[in-house]
């Protein structure tokens, strides 16, 4: 039997307002509204919390019966829909211990896990997975790309008691591995031996000057020489112009700086590699994954352009149940959502074309009127006469 610690689908109208608490840490936090957005698969089922004010911080949270994930799998799952074509804004959730003062939740409030998509400018389109380990927020060392389209997507984080994890988007695995390998929770297993240093006589030169090579006698020639073909101009006046000096030219016999031939260095020892030792500061931690207490799920976000919808929150210990829940919610409505969006886009295109046609028609009508106005006044004549006179109908 799966343990479901938290589940929120917003299926009871305004009922969510009694379960979710707004932070009062700042007076100008943005407001969440219940909405299924401009397009959806099912108007009722797709209702979720939507950010409604541009350029705001948001801070809203819901509490649940506190639990620990020690010795069991933790699954965090929710859907996010950036229907506003987001430029910069968060779509992630934070899991807090139940000691959090929900009315004072803010960006620096200590959390256990932060997970979900984040988009900001061209440089950030990633899924954050951050664990608070011994008081420090530790970021994943991998780059997990998030979805940046306008549709609803399902994000799932699985953390297992064997210290492995998995990130899924739309019920497909996008990343997995071990917590110790993919985060810097622990000091490195090996470090450079602090007592080792490169021996004085360690020769890292692969090639050396050939000691038997010597510079040829005739090597040193000046780079520039007086032009032997230059002649003093006839009208050169030494008193007026000073002593005549021929212009200089590049010396064809100049050989440049002499460098001895290179030979293999008989004493070459290769590049010195700093020996490593076991790091005395390293000790494995089999309980990296574990937290004593989860009690609050929070949305602590910044959004430049609002419109993001959060829905179908689930915290459980059962991977299969989470996958099933995802398929029964996001899975069921995603196709219809796309259909509705495509239909809207098509209608918009049609409207745009109609508007363009109308505009063109108006322009043609206006041009006709203008031409009539600018033509000379014509006498009332029959068409045949008019044609003979050279009049042409506009």
């Amino acid at each position: 039997e799966p343990a479901v610690y938290f589940k929120e689908q917003f299926l009871d109208g305004d009922g969510w307002t009694s379960r979710w608490i707004e932070s009062k840490h700042k007076s100008d936090f943005g407001k969440f509204v219940l909405s299924s957005g401009k397009f959806y698969g099912d108007e009722e089922k797709d209702k979720g919390l939507q950010t409604s004010q541009d350029a705001r911080f948001y801070a809203l949270s819901a509490s649940f019966e506190p639990f620990s994930n020690k010795g069991q799998t933790l699954v965090v799952q929710f859907t996010v829909k950036h229907e506003q074509n987001i430029d910069c804004g968060g779509g992630y959730v934070k899991l807090f211990p139940n000691s959090l003062d929900q009315t004072d939740m803010h960006g620096d409030s200590e959390y256990n896990i932060m997970f979900g998509p984040d988009i900001c400018g061209p440089g950030t389109k990633k899924v954050h997975v951050i664990f608070n380990y011994k008081g420090k927020n530790v970021l994943i060392n991998k780059d997990i790309r998030c979805k940046d389209d306008e549709f609803t997507h399902l994000y799932t984080l699985i953390v297992r008691p064997d210290n492995t994890y998995e990130v899924k988007i739309d019920n497909s695995q996008v990343e997995s591995g071990s917590l110790e390998d993919d985060w810097d929770f622990l000091p490195p297993k090996k470090i450079k031996d602090p007592d080792a240093s490169k021996p004085e006589d360690w020769d890292e030169r692969a090639k050396i000057d050939d000691p038997t090579d010597s510079k040829p006698e005739d090597w040193d020639k000046p780079e520039h020489i007086p032009d032997p073909d230059a002649k003093k101009p006839e009208d050169w006046d030494e008193e007026m112009d000073g002593e005549w000096e021929p212009p200089v030219i590049q010396n064809p016999e100049y050989k440049g700086e002499w460098k001895p031939r290179q030979i293999d260095n008989p004493d070459y020892k290769g590049t010195w590699i700093h020996p490593e030792i076991d790091n005395p500061e390293y000790s494995p931690d089999p309980s990296i994954y574990a937290y004593d207490n989860f009690g609050v799920l929070g949305l602590d976000l910044w959004q430049v352009k609002s419109g993001t919808i959060f829905d179908n929150f689930l915290i459980t210990n059962d991977e299969a149940y989470a996958e099933e829940f995802g398929n029964e919610t996001w899975g069921v409505t995603k196709a219809a959502e796309k259909q509705m969006k495509d239909k809207q886009d098509e209608e918009q295109r049609t409207r745009r074309m109609m508007r363009t046609k109308m505009r063109m028609r108006r322009m043609r009508r206006t041009r006709r009127k203008m031409r009539r106005k600018m033509s000379p006044a014509r006498p009332r004549t029959s068409c045949r006469e008019a044609c003979l006179q050279g009049w042409t109908e506009a």
Epitope: C88, G107, D118, I119, C120, G123, T124, D300
Partner: antibody
């Protein structure tokens, strides 16, 4: 990579204000957070505040609250730091520094340090 | 407010290893960044997030953070490493710098 070029040296009277500019080039201005750090002669570095141009909101060190205003103009990729009610202790080199914006929260760029610095602007406050 | 403590000066012979410490209350819970500043120049980021090196910074520079001290280690010290070094953290929406350490390369 972004480059930061600051305005020239200033000599100011006590009680007046100074506005230093920091123009970014070679990168997307909205992808960075800009911090202002000052260094009095022979002293260490002191953070004054910062701004994330894409957010438009600034964050100030307690010590300078009410006396410093940090702004950004995205159209010219320029950040500004204005310090008012100048006193002789404000004589320092003022640096702007950028941090890559790796997310949509105030805290993100502070995970990464300030990886590009301007050349510094010397402000002398003297009567 | 949060404070970071650095030794005012550290001296080291060329080729040897220099260690500069940065102490602060529960500093291991912070991400520590290190900057190098040579006379008359702007600071340069040499280590971020405790131990990561920005591109272009030699491998000789490394960092660690455990217990109540973060450490910047410079192995095989060169004359060009002589500079002031500052540690920095982010605490309660504020950037905090250490007082700086002057590294002198002997000889």
């Amino acid at each position: 990579e972004v480059q930061l070029v600051q305005s020239g040296a200033e000599v100011k009277k006590p009680g007046s204000s100074v506005k230093v500019s920091c123009k970014a080039s070679g990168g997307t201005f909205s992808s960075y957070a800009i911090s202002w750090v000052r260094q009095a002669p022979g002293q260490g570095l002191e953070w004054m505040g910062g701004i994330i141009p894409i957010f438009g909101t600034a964050n100030y060190a307690q010590k300078f609250q009410g006396r410093v205003t940090i702004t950004a103009d995205e159209s010219t990729s320029t950040a500004y730091m204005e310090l008012s009610s100048l006193r002789s202790e404000d004589t320092a080199v003022y640096y702007c520094a950028s941090s890559p914006l790796r997310g949509s929260g105030w805290y993100w760029h502070y995970y990464y340090g300030m990886d590009v610095w301007g050349q510094g602007t010397t402000v002398t406050v003297s009567s | 407010s949060y404070e970071l403590t650095q030794p005012p000066s550290v001296s080291v012979a060329p080729g040897k290893t220099a260690r500069i410490t940065c102490g602060g209350n529960n500093i291991r819970a912070k991400h520590v960044h290190w900057y190098q500043q040579k006379p008359g120049q702007s600071p340069v980021l040499v280590i971020y997030q405790d131990s990561k090196r920005p591109s272009g910074i030699p491998e000789r520079f490394s960092g660690s953070n455990s217990g109540s001290t973060a450490t910047l280690t410079i192995s095989r010290v060169e004359a060009g490493d002589e500079a002031d070094y500052y540690c920095q953290v982010w605490d309660s929406s504020t950037v905090v710098f250490g007082g700086g350490t002057k590294l002198t390369v002997l000889g």
